[in-house]
Interface confidence: medium
Amino acid sequence: CDLPQTHSLGSRRTLMLLAQMRKISLFSCLKDRHDFGFPQEEFGNQFQKAETIPVLHEMIQQIFNLFSTKDSSAAWDETLLDKFYTELYQQLNDLEACVIQGVGVTETPLMKEDSILAVRKYFQRITLYLKEKKYSPCAWEVVRAEIMRSFSLSTNLQESLRSKE
């Protein structure tokens, strides 16, 4: 399965929307910085596109979940959030279409399950951090910047694999 060209464009637009969502400067939130331990190796270790697709799907699904909570709706601009959801939803559809076409439908390798679990744990750490920081504006800004970084890394690694095929 070949992901449509629009998937690549959607990734860039998602980053653009995340950038536009910024409300305060990260420099004013230095005391709130946190290393969430993004499992970058889980995207780099997959040697076939078939293996990256479920991991990338999990990543986007978790971003969707994170930004579609009540607390998130209160933190961000509604119009930008709606566009953000639309872009994420389209990317999830693209990835799901690939799974339906047979990519990753066969028995899931243990390595892939471990990778998906690593992504889930990463988002659990982000959710816990937000709770501990009582969903403060600085906490949300730290999370927004982190998601920009990790989403950019994961899509770049996935595109890198795609270009090698």
Partner: antibody, heavy 119, light 108 residues
Amino acid sequence: QVQLQQPGAELVKPGASVKLSCKASGYTFTNYWMHWVKQRPGQGLEWIGEINPSHGRTIYNENFKSKATLTVDKSSITAFMQLSSLTSEDSAVYFCARGGLGPAWFAYWGQGTLVTVSA
Amino acid sequence: QIVLTQSPAIMSASPGEKVTLTCSAGSSVDSSYLYWYQQKPGSSPKLWIYSTSNLASGVPARFSGSGSGTSYSLTISSMEAEDAASYFCHQWSSYPFTFGSGTKLEIK
């Protein structure tokens, strides 16, 4: 500051090929997609395609798929576009432009290379 | 592909006059991805307005942009000699990215 350097002109014969260059400076080359745009004399702009210098992935306008080939050389931080089987229709100015997000989208352009196809 | 039609193709305006250039899309364009570029003879295009209504760095405040769906416009509240140039609308809402045919704005 961000700069995209292109040679001023290329004179080529019909049926031949030409490889245009676009040397980048002032930013991290692999962080931004590079786009190519065609402009015929006194006419509008046509998007040819884009390449991600990080891993070489390309996306083309269907109208240029058999005409243009986009490549990059990371060591010389240069993007290239090869145009093949040239005809008079290919006589135009070709610009490279850097992609980006929001206000950075096509915010930086090369000066353009004038390609003249003539016997 | 999304065809962008600009009108008028050529227009003249006197200094101080209000000018409106239009860009009509063949199918709906997300306003976030509708841009305008200014180009002067012998030069490369310059980003002028991004995401329909945001002025690029260094663009005078007399310029403004508006629109949604299939209808967009660029307005100059008070024409000045330095505004004489060609203006192109551009969309990256969907592939292939397209540009309008341009409006050449001249000073009277």
